[in-house]
């Protein structure tokens, strides 16, 4: 008998090269075969459970950046007046959540902020739990 | 043939809203359907393997806080004279280990220390390994 | 019917007690039953996917340390003029990658640097993906 294979784990890596004041960071998924999807500049959560979240980026100017997942809830990450981020977190997310950026810039040099190495990774930690597609 | 489902991953999120000097932080599990259990203010480890550990909290006063897993072993986390914690770690834990807090306070404004956003998450990273229940 | 078991997750913990200038840190795997292997002082990657990476160590002298995975790619971690490290990261690694240290010391007191608590952990986060052995 063939040993059971793992069904694919819900995970995604998105990149962002620019962020806009009072909007967010424009995210793109470089890989076609990600198991999670981007929609309206947000990462869509289909499966309940803990997620490992990695956020990296080097910004052209100082900004304040928050990563949200649900209206009326506190942010997953909140960084005030930074020029870079390299953070790891764990959070419980659920079906219908959407992970998105909110950005405030503190300068008027440019209308957007450029990002080097901008990367957001989400990896589901509870396969076997509830999912809805 | 139905593709195999994942058995549930051992994981737990406990919350703590207060810590007592020379005791620890009083932990409660808000969810009934956690796959790990709290007993005598400790999280019980049933499965050998690596665990992803996330610890967060904002304290009402300065304290020194350690998170232990086994008598005679060094702490998983040790923070001295802090007012907040937001840490992630990886550790190898084994059946019979118990994860618990030790706290020392440096002030006597109140008889205990209150905690906002106090959260400890453990997620097993090696399903398929040895477990005993 | 017996519920399906998880095949073992690719993971490894290596220890290092000394690092050599312009070489790296000498890594050993204390456990016989790791699911990943050490070869030529590097950890061999057989499976594509995200990896959770934990790096810890307390050094006898100041050093600059980088952790690489592929020639021509930036490091997984890069720390300049430090005496300790306690970092967690997430990275996408692939078959044929090799994880290894590069070290530069800034002193000539000794020809090598001793390390207390030197530990590198890798845990695969995408079981079910491509592996080659």
């Amino acid at each position: 008998q063939v040993p059971p294979q793992y069904p694919p784990i819900q995970s995604i890596r998105v990149q962002f090269t620019r962020c806009e004041n009072e909007k967010g960071c424009i995210i793109t998924s470089p890989s076609k075969d990600e198991t999670m999807k981007v929609q309206d500049n947000s990462i869509i959560i289909n499966c309940d459970g803990f997620y490992l979240i990695s956020l990296k980026g080097y910004f052209s100017e100082e900004l304040s950046l928050s990563l949200y997942y649900r209206k009326g809830r506190g942010p997953l990450f909140s960084l005030s007046k930074v020029t870079s981020v390299d953070s790891i977190g764990v959070a419980y997310l659920a079906f219908k959540d959407k992970v998105y950026f909110n950005v405030t810039t503190h300068s008027t040099s440019y209308k957007d902020i450029q990002v080097n190495g901008g990367e957001l990774i989400l990896i589901h930690q509870n396969p076997g739990g509830f999912c809805a597609y | 043939q139905v593709p195999p489902q994942y058995p549930p991953i051992q994981s737990i999120r406990v919350q703590f809203t207060r810590c007592e000097n020379e005791k620890g932080c009083i932990i409660t599990s808000p969810s009934k359907d956690e796959t790990m259990k709290v007993q005598d203010n400790s999280i019980i480890i049933n499965c050998d393997g690596f665990y992803l550990i996330s610890l967060k909290g904002y304290f009402s006063e300065e304290l020194s806080l350690s998170l232990y897993y086994r008598k005679g072993r060094g702490p998983l986390f040790s923070l001295s004279k802090v007012t907040s914690v937001d840490s992630i770690g990886v550790a190898y834990l084994a059946f019979k280990d118990k994860v618990y807090f030790n706290v020392t306070t440096h002030s006597t404004s109140y008889k205990d220390i209150q905690v906002n956003g106090g959260e400890l998450i453990l997620i097993h990273q090696n399903p398929g390994g040895f477990c005993a229940y | 019917q017996v519920p399906p078991q998880y095949p073992p997750i690719q993971s490894i913990r290596v220890q290092f007690t000394r690092c050599e200038n312009e070489k790296g840190c000498i890594i050993t795997s204390p456990s016989k039953d790791e699911t990943m292997k050490v070869q030529d002082n590097s950890i061999i990657i057989n499976c594509d996917g995200f990896y959770l990476i934990s790096l810890k160590g307390y050094f006898s002298e100041e050093l600059s340390l980088s952790l690489y995975y592929r020639k021509g790619r930036g490091p997984l971690f890069s720390l300049s003029k430090v005496t300790s490290v306690d970092s967690i990261g997430v990275a996408y690694l692939a078959f044929k990658d090799k994880v290894y240290f590069n070290v530069t010391t800034h002193s000539t007191s000794y020809k090598d640097i001793q390390v207390n608590g030197g530990e590198l952990i890798l845990i695969h986060q995408n079981p079910g993906g491509f592996c080659a052995y």
């Epitope: 009326g72 809830r73 506190g74 942010p75 909140s78 | 809203t17 207060r18 904002y58 304290f59 009402s60 007012t83 907040s84 404004s109 109140y110 209150q114 906002n116 956003g117 | -």
Partner: antibody, heavy 119, light 112 residues
Framework: EVQLVESGGDLLKPGGSLRLSCVAS????????MTWVRQAPGKGLQWVAA????????YYTDAVKGRFTISRDNARNTVFLQMNSLRAEDTAVYYC????????????WGQGTLVTVSS | DIVMTQTPPSLSVSPRETPSISCKAS???????????LEWYLQKPGQSPQLLIY???NRFTGVSDRFSGSGSGTDFTLRISRVEANDAGVYYC?????????FGAGTKVELK
Amino acid sequence: EVQLVESGGDLLKPGGSLRLSCVASGFPFRNYDMTWVRQAPGKGLQWVAAIHYDGSNTYYTDAVKGRFTISRDNARNTVFLQMNSLRAEDTAVYYCAKKFNNYRPFDYWGQGTLVTVSS
Amino acid sequence: DIVMTQTPPSLSVSPRETPSISCKASQSLLRSDGNTYLEWYLQKPGQSPQLLIYLVSNRFTGVSDRFSGSGSGTDFTLRISRVEANDAGVYYCGQGTQLPWTFGAGTKVELK
């Protein structure tokens, strides 16, 4: 030493708007829920609004719901009270007070700032 | 809302006397966590309020042991032993058991 310093009080006409500020020091501000309490001339204390340590939730007394907004800037250790559609009965000294969470009292208060609403 | 009723509205006392102030809540202040969130505050003339007592009977940092609180459920008392000139002001009870947090109308303590 804990300090809470309010500012922004003024005399204005009914229907007007005002923004009060409270700058905190001497304690880990970002850890604490913060509140505003007011005291009409010669009267007692009335709790007005509260905000969670991370800004995720806000609470108001019924008399100001929909007119007042509490907010905070943890980077600047400041809590704000935006007051719109002001009425004569909003005339009071407004105190900023720290209250770590629902399990703790109002343990330190600012000196207050006077808001007068009169035609 | 929980209504807090303080009596008497005012007190005139001589130094070294031991006055008491009563506070009644319109419903029990015992919360499901087993604690009773009843506090006492003092507002001295021209100053902002200051915390004296929390959780019915616990004195806050720096508060003289001449101040003591007691009671349970809906009925509470603040006792000031050997009153001093510096104790003059308006005393308020307050409840933190349930939103909206509410205060009594105050008891003005004057020294003869």
